[in-house]
Interface confidence: medium
């Protein structure tokens, strides 16, 4: 039996700049029941506060609701582990919520096979920003990627589309079924997970509908 090992805060993420969550790895418990507490202060302030919500985001986590989230403020966050033999504290994590946004994936992915006047076929991929993202006001500037592959292929083909919410893919094989996904990233922050997969078959004998 021994004091607990040093915890490590391994991740903090915000879906929308309005709330965020931090998760920690506990380290060894020293063979004893061990309590964990997350405390934080804000840059330039003297007060230290305890995590407002240990439940919402699951075990070994702290959820900061709107009420507790400020942007352009550095949060200085530590996790303390305590058992009857002693305690240990994580290295501090210095977090600015502005930079830890991991949004939901884009929504309403639509796929349409189209044809140019010269009979060249292309796949028109369109989507919308994630619901929570206020793109219009400039609160978020979102960049996108799409990926696609034929059902037979092993590798995804990835296209960066910048701020565009549509993309045309040429040189697809007729008769093949293609899988398509999109993801997005705010100006500062992380790529979302890839969104729901959609599929479409490129017809063998495509003729333009009126």
């Amino acid at each position: 039996q021994s004091p607990p090992g040093k915890p490590e805060i391994h991740k903090c993420r915000s879906p929308d700049k309005e709330t965020f969550t931090c998760w920690w790895n506990p380290g060894s418990d020293g063979g004893l029941p061990t309590n964990y507490s997350l405390t934080y202060s804000k840059e330039g302030e003297k007060n230290t506060y305890e995590c407002p919500d240990y439940k919402t985001s699951g075990p070994n986590s702290c959820f900061f609701s709107k009420q507790y989230t400020s942007i352009w403020k550095i949060y200085i966050i530590t996790v303390n582990a305590t058992n009857e033999m002693g305690s240990s504290t994580s290295d501090p994590l210095y977090v600015d919520v502005t930079y830890i946004v991991e949004p939901e994936p884009p929504r309403n992915l639509t796929l349409e096979v189209k044809q140019l006047k010269d009979k060249k076929t292309y796949l028109w991929v369109k989507w919308l920003p994630p619901t929570i993202t206020d793109v219009k006001t400039g609160w978020f500037t979102m960049e996108y990627e799409i990926r696609l592959k034929s059902e037979e292929a092993d590798e995804w083909e990835i296209h960066f589309t910048g701020h565009q919410t549509q993309f045309k893919v040429f040189d697809l094989y007729p008769g093949q079924k293609y899988l398509v996904q999109t993801r997005c990233k705010p100006d500062h922050g992380y790529w979302s997970r890839w969104g729901q997969e959609k599929s479409i078959e490129i017809p063998n004998d495509f003729t333009l509908k009126d």
Partner: antibody, heavy 122, light 112 residues
Framework: EVKLVESGGGLVQPGGSLKLSCAAS????????MFWVRQTPEKSLEWVAY????????YYPDTVKGRFTISRDNAKNTLYLQMSRLKSEDTAMYYC???????????????WGQGTSVTVSS | DVLMTQTPLSLPVSLGDQASISCRSS???????????LEWYLQKPGQSPKLLIY???NRFSGVPDRFSGSGSGTDFTLKISRVEAEDLGVYYC?????????FGSGTKLEIK
């Protein structure tokens, strides 16, 4: 505990090359910008390079631009500095350091390694 | 490049005294995002530099409150309210607002 361990320094002739490594542990390496800083024998400090957490963004001062390349392998938790066309004025102790702030927020070298010595001399 | 000028180069003090180090930048180091990335580092003999203060006045975790930073624009000051033996070493200011980032030449704090 945040730990940075540099290696790869040594004696090299002018015009030669050297690759420094910095092994990182105790934190999620891929979430932090990283820096190389050097200290001359006269004890002046000079920022040499920085690299964004994903490796897509790098910056150098003019004194090393075109000769030095900073890179990282996030799978191996390792930072590198490839130095070529070395000059006597590159003789220094080379430190790797980690940005204080989590992810992309700018500034502050919160953690430093113990340094690795590079001597450029014929 | 932004030139960082530190004064004095050497600062002899008695233990318990207040010490003050000045750092002046050749141009404003207010970043376009409104922050001023002015930092202070202490290098003790035989050790690597350690961060003391970031963004002008914020103490790094574990740094005693006898250290304080102040200033704006181009003029910055590091104050140590009561010097202790463990504070001796070379202090460097650093600006991280404009590339290339630059250090001051250093101020050696030593016993009088």
């Amino acid at each position: 505990e945040v730990k940075l361990v540099e290696s790869g320094g040594g004696l090299v002739q002018p015009g030669g090359s050297l690759k420094l490594s910095c092994a990182a542990s105790g934190f999620t390496f891929s979430d932090y910008y990283m820096f190389w800083v050097r200290q001359t024998p006269e004890k002046s400090l000079e920022w040499v390079a920085y690299i964004s957490n994903g490796g897509g963004s790098t910056y150098y001062p003019d004194t090393v631009k075109g000769r030095f390349t900073i890179s990282r392998d996030n799978a191996k938790n390792t930072l590198y500095l490839q130095m070529s066309r070395l000059k006597s004025e590159d003789t220094a102790m080379y430190y790797c350091s980690r940005q204080l702030f989590y992810y992309g927020s700018r500034g502050a070298m919160g953690y430093w390694g113990q340094g690795t010595s590079v001597t450029v001399s014929s | 490049d932004v030139l960082m000028t530190q004064t004095p180069l050497s600062l002899p003090v008695s233990l318990g005294d207040q010490a003050s180090i000045s750092c002046r930048s050749s141009q404003s180091i207010v970043h376009s995002n409104g922050n001023t990335y002015l930092e202070w580092y202490l290098q003790k003999p035989g050790q690597s530099p350690k961060l003391l203060i970031y963004k002008v006045s914020n103490r790094f975790s574990g740094v005693p409150d006898r250290f304080s930073g102040s200033g704006s624009g181009t003029d910055f000051t590091l104050k140590i309210s009561r010097v202790e033996a463990e504070d001796l070493g070379v202090y460097y200011c650093f600006q991280g607002s404009h590339v290339p980032f630059t250090f001051g030449s250093g101020t050696k704090l030593e016993i009088k």
